[in-house]
Interface confidence: low
Amino acid sequence: GITIPRNPGCPNSEDKNFPRTVMVNLNIHNRNTNTNPKRSSDYYNRSTSPWNLHRNEDPERYPSVIWEAKCRHLGCINADGNVDYHMNSVPIQQEILVLRREPPHCPNSFRLEKILVSVGCTCVTPIVHHVA
Amino acid sequence: GITIPRNPGCPNSEDKNFPRTVMVNLNIHNRNTNTNPKRSSDYYNRSTSPWNLHRNEDPERYPSVIWEAKCRHLGCINADGNVDYHMNSVPIQQEILVLRREPPHCPNSFRLEKILVSVGCTCVTPIVHHVA
C-alpha cells in the first residue's frame, strides 16, 4: 500500500514492553516569551472575589508544584470594601495535563494525568431557588 | 544526598540519542471522577466580569482543542446590569503543559510545551495613577 514517508529522525518506540507509550522531550518549549511576567499576580488581592493561593507539591508529578486558588469569602467585596452576600465568589476551574511518574520512582517513565485545578475566583450572581 | 531507590521495573531510556527524553503512557488517568461535570460552565455568563469562550484548535498538539476566555467588557457589570467602568474585567491566566508533535510526522514522538491560556475573567479595582 501507499506509505507516508516517516521522518528518518523519528525515535524507535517499538519496544513491546511499553504499549500505549510515546517518547516525550522534556526540554520544554515556552511559547509565552512575550507575556508580562507579572501577569495576573496581583489580581488575587484586587479582585471583588479575592483568593488565596495554596501550594500543592508532589515530587512524583511534573510540574511538581501547582498553585491552587481558594476563594476568601462566600460573597463578593462591594464598593465599601465589605462582603456582599447577595453575590457569590466562585472558583474558576480548569482541567490540566500533568505527568505522573509511573511506575513510582522511575526517573524516565511517566503517565499522562488530568487534574482539575482552581485558577482564581470570579464574582457571580447567585442562582436563587424560589420555594412555592 | 539521599537517593530514592530506582524501581527495578523502570524502562531503560538511557539512549544517548534522546537527551531529556522520557517514555510517557498516553492512557490518561483522570483524577476528576467526582467533580461536577457542569463545573464552572455557566459562570462565564453569571459573572460580573463575563467572558466568551473561543475555540483554539491545533491538530499537532495534545490536547488539540483548548478554550480561551476573552472578557466581554473593559468594565464590570453592576447591580443594575450596566457596565461600570470604574472597575476592570481582567483575564485570569494560567500556564499549562501540552504535548507538541516533534519532529513533525513522527507518530510517537512529542515535546512538552508551555502555553499561557486565559481561563476566565475576574473583576478588579483598577490601579489609578495620580498625576502630581
Epitope: 507516508i4 516517516r6 511499553f18 504499549p19 500505549r20 510515546v22 | 498516553l26 498538539r61 508533535r101 507518530p107
Partner: nanobody
Framework: QVQLQQSGGGSVQTGGSLTLTCAAS????????LGWFRQSPGKEREFVAA???????DYADSVKGRFFISRDNTMNTVYLQMNSLKPEDTGIYTC??????????????WGQGTMVTVSS
C-alpha cells in the same frame, strides 16, 4: 517502514453489509488511536469512526448505529463493520493511525484506501 494495509471493500446493494480490515506494521500499534475516513465523490475527506488506545470509540453522526469499529491489539488490526449501507456511504475508505486521532480527527499515517460502492 510504517504501513497500514487495507482489505475488504467492494460493491453491495442498499441495506447490505461489508467489513473493512486494516493491518498495521512498523509502529507501536497500541500507542495509537486507529480509525477510518472516507471520501465520497465530489466531497472532502470526512471522519467516519475511531477507536483510541483507551478503547474509547467515536463515530460520525451519519454512521452511528450502522457502523461498528473494533481493534485487535494482538493482531495489530482494526476493523470497520458496515451494516444497513446506503448509496451515500459510497466512497474511498481509508484507514488512519495517530496518537491524537480520537481528539482531532486528523491523522499522520494513512492506508492506501479501498473503494466501497453502494447501489440502489
Amino acid at each position: 517502514q510504517v504501513q497500514l494495509q487495507q482489505s475488504g471493500g467492494g460493491s453491495v446493494q442498499t441495506g447490505g453489509s461489508l467489513t473493512l480490515t486494516c493491518a498495521a506494521s512498523g509502529l507501536t500499534f497500541e500507542a495509537n488511536s486507529l480509525g477510518w475516513f472516507r471520501q465520497s465523490p465530489g466531497k472532502e475527506r470526512e471522519f467516519v469512526a475511531a477507536v483510541s488506545f483507551t478503547k474509547r470509540i467515536d463515530y460520525a453522526d451519519s454512521v452511528k448505529g450502522r457502523f461498528f469499529i473494533s481493534r485487535d491489539n494482538t493482531m495489530n488490526t482494526v476493523y470497520l463493520q458496515m451494516n444497513s449501507l446506503k448509496p451515500e456511504d459510497t466512497g474511498i475508505y481509508t484507514c488512519a493511525a495517530d496518537p491524537l486521532l480520537i481528539s482531532n480527527k486528523r491523522a499522520n499515517i494513512w492506508g492506501q484506501g479501498t473503494m466501497v460502492t453502494v447501489s440502489s
